[in-house]
């Protein structure tokens, strides 16, 4: 439960989050596991340890092996594991599965790749973007943040997308490559006014306080590709981002289904241990394509039931 | 050593609210969470909610949710709990306790509430 | 809801004895279990976290073990001392405290 894998490639910077999470203010040790030494946090270590984070700077094959990291509150105690592998640069193009993160799937009209992992970083824009290792040229492709755009996606898009940006420590630059699998889903079609399936205008969703919740905003647009579909969550008519509550956050990027040769979008809005002030908001769903935007309204209630003791 | 002092015994009457103050010494109150935990007389430790007093996030325990204010002076390092609509069974000993997300370590030593008409 | 079954409520044992209180839950939770004893008239006192840390001062005899739905607080040689009521608390989904166990001298 407190165990994560986290890998990288020799010579390139790699940062591990601790997978027990506390205050900022916590302090958090970290030790080989194998030999319990203490990972130092004077930054003109290799390694070294900033808090929360465990950083290779750059990344050594023999760094491979599994790190404690303990989290210190005044009163506790609390242990988590990196389990940390670090490959050779393959001589080839080929990306081994073990070196590939989640595989994402894009529609033919546009479609976002985030680039795995990079919030944990320093990094600045641009982007670099490689697809098969070959560097991604043309207007077709738009380094956007922390994601690449691909506009009018065929099928022949697919494939293993690399990014690659610097890492900054101290004035010192490190580079970090992420790859994952792109998927295109073939399909000629038309576009309407969205559609949405979920959740119906006005709807009202029972919670349990102190609870996870979760609302899905799902939409479809036309069939086949669509140029441009997006959904997204507003609470009381602001964007999440301006929404200064990190308890409720919206899905990064958006699923794409095909329902009945219809294409739909959807994103999740996870509202993590509801509290009661989440029942005064207004949550929006919104559904934008080139024939306009659709708006459903959901709200939250307190769950009733009986208590026995 | 860390101690937790809270306020005196109270009495109030059915629909009245009460305020406890827990004061903590030897420790900084932003450096972890206060926990809440009621005990009802002869009856089991039941928890209340917990609040982060470096930002105020505060969570509560369904049963006690509408009703249970948690509140934290980083000032004086002083917590509070202030249960309203106060009924019969309400009636018990009320802790505070510091500890992190997970658990309480160091608790106060009680403060009874009694409610009658 | 996560719901802890604690057992036994009430324990007769003697001086020396070695006792075994279990606390099951409803769903996995790991090792995010704890135990606490309190005496009459007193706070409750931490003994174990996340199922078999031991908190500093804590005599050896106590011991806790056990994962996923199952844990346990064994004592080896019962004490004068710990004739007491012991609760395991949960913190994997908020908190919530077993119904106590009792434990009374023989």
């Known amino acids: 439960k407190f165990s994560k894998q986290s890998w990288g490639l020799e010579n390139e910077a790699l940062i591990v989050r601790c997978p027990r999470q506390g205050k900022s203010s916590y302090i958090v040790d970290w030790y080989y596991s194998q030999t319990n030494k203490s990972i130092p946090t004077q930054e003109r270590n290799r390694v070294f340890a900033s808090g929360q984070l465990l950083k290779f700077l750059p990344a050594e094959v023999a760094d491979s092996g599994i790190y404690t990291c303990i989290v210190r509150s005044p009163t506790f105690n609390r242990t988590g594991y990196a389990n940390v592998t670090i490959y050779k640069k393959q001589p080839d193009c080929n990306v081994p599965d073990y070196l590939m993160y989640s595989t994402v799937s894009g529609s033919e009209k546009n479609s976002k790749i985030y680039c795995p992992t990079i919030d944990l970083y320093n990094w600045t824009a641009p982007l670099e973007w490689f697809k098969n290792c070959q560097a991604l040229q043309g207007s077709r492709y738009k380094a956007h943040k922390s994601f690449l755009v691909i506009d009018n996606v065929m099928t022949d898009d697919a494939g293993d997308y690399t990014c690659k940006f610097i890492h900054n420590e101290n004035g010192a630059n490190y580079s970090v490559t992420a790859t994952r699998s792109f998927t295109v889903k073939d399909e000629q079609g038309f576009s309407l006014f969205p559609v949405i399936r979920a959740p119906a205008h006005n709807e009202t969703k029972e919670v349990e306080i102190g609870e996870n919740t979760n609302l899905t905003c799902s939409a479809c647009f036309g069939k086949g590709a669509q140029f441009l579909a997006t959904v997204q969550w507003q609470l009381n008519g602001n964007k999440i981002t301006d929404f200064s509550e990190p308890r409720i956050q919206q899905e990064e990027g958006q699923n794409q289904s095909f329902s009945n040769g219809l294409a739909c979008v959807n994103t999740v809005l996870r509202i993590a241990d509801v509290k009661e002030e989440d029942l005064l908001l207004r949550y929006d769903c919104l559904a934008l394509n080139l024939h306009g935007l659709r708006r459903h309204t959901i709200r939250l209630s307190r769950k009733h039931h009986h208590h026995h003791h | 050593e860390v101690q937790l002092v809270q306020s005196g015994a109270e009495v109030k009457k059915p629909g009245a609210t009460v305020k406890i103050s827990c004061k903590v010494s030897?420790?900084?109150?932003?450096?972890?969470?206060m926990h809440w935990v009621q005990q009802a007389p002869g009856k089991g430790l039941e928890w209340m909610g917990r609040i982060d007093p470096a930002i105020g996030n505060t969570e509560y325990a369904e049963k006690f949710q509408g009703r249970v204010t948690i509140t934290a002076d980083t000032s004086t390092d002083t917590a509070y709990m202030e249960l309203s609509s106060l009924r019969s069974e309400d009636t018990a000993v009320y802790y505070c306790?510091?500890?992190?997300?997970?658990?309480?370590?160091?608790w106060g030593q009680g403060t009874l509430v009694t409610v009658s008409s | 809801d996560i719901q802890l079954t604690q057992s036994p409520s009430f324990l007769s044992a003697s001086v020396g004895d070695r006792v075994t209180i279990t606390c099951i839950t409803n769903?996995?939770?790991?090792?995010?279990i704890h135990w606490y004893q309190q005496k009459p008239g007193k706070a409750p006192k931490l003994l174990i976290y996340?199922?078999?840390t031991l908190r500093p001062g804590v005599p050896s005899r106590f011991s806790g073990s056990g994962s996923g739905t199952e844990f346990t607080l064994t004592i080896s040689s019962l004490q004068p001392e710990d004739f007491a009521t012991y609760y395991c608390l949960q913190s994997d989904n908020m908190l919530t405290f077993g119904q106590g166990t009792k434990l009374e001298i023989k």
């Open positions: 306790a510091t500890g992190d997300f997970y658990a309480m370590a160091y």
């Open positions: 030897a420790f900084n109150i932003k450096d972890d969470y």
């Open positions: 769903t996995d939770i790991d090792d995010v």
């Open positions: 996340e199922g078999n």
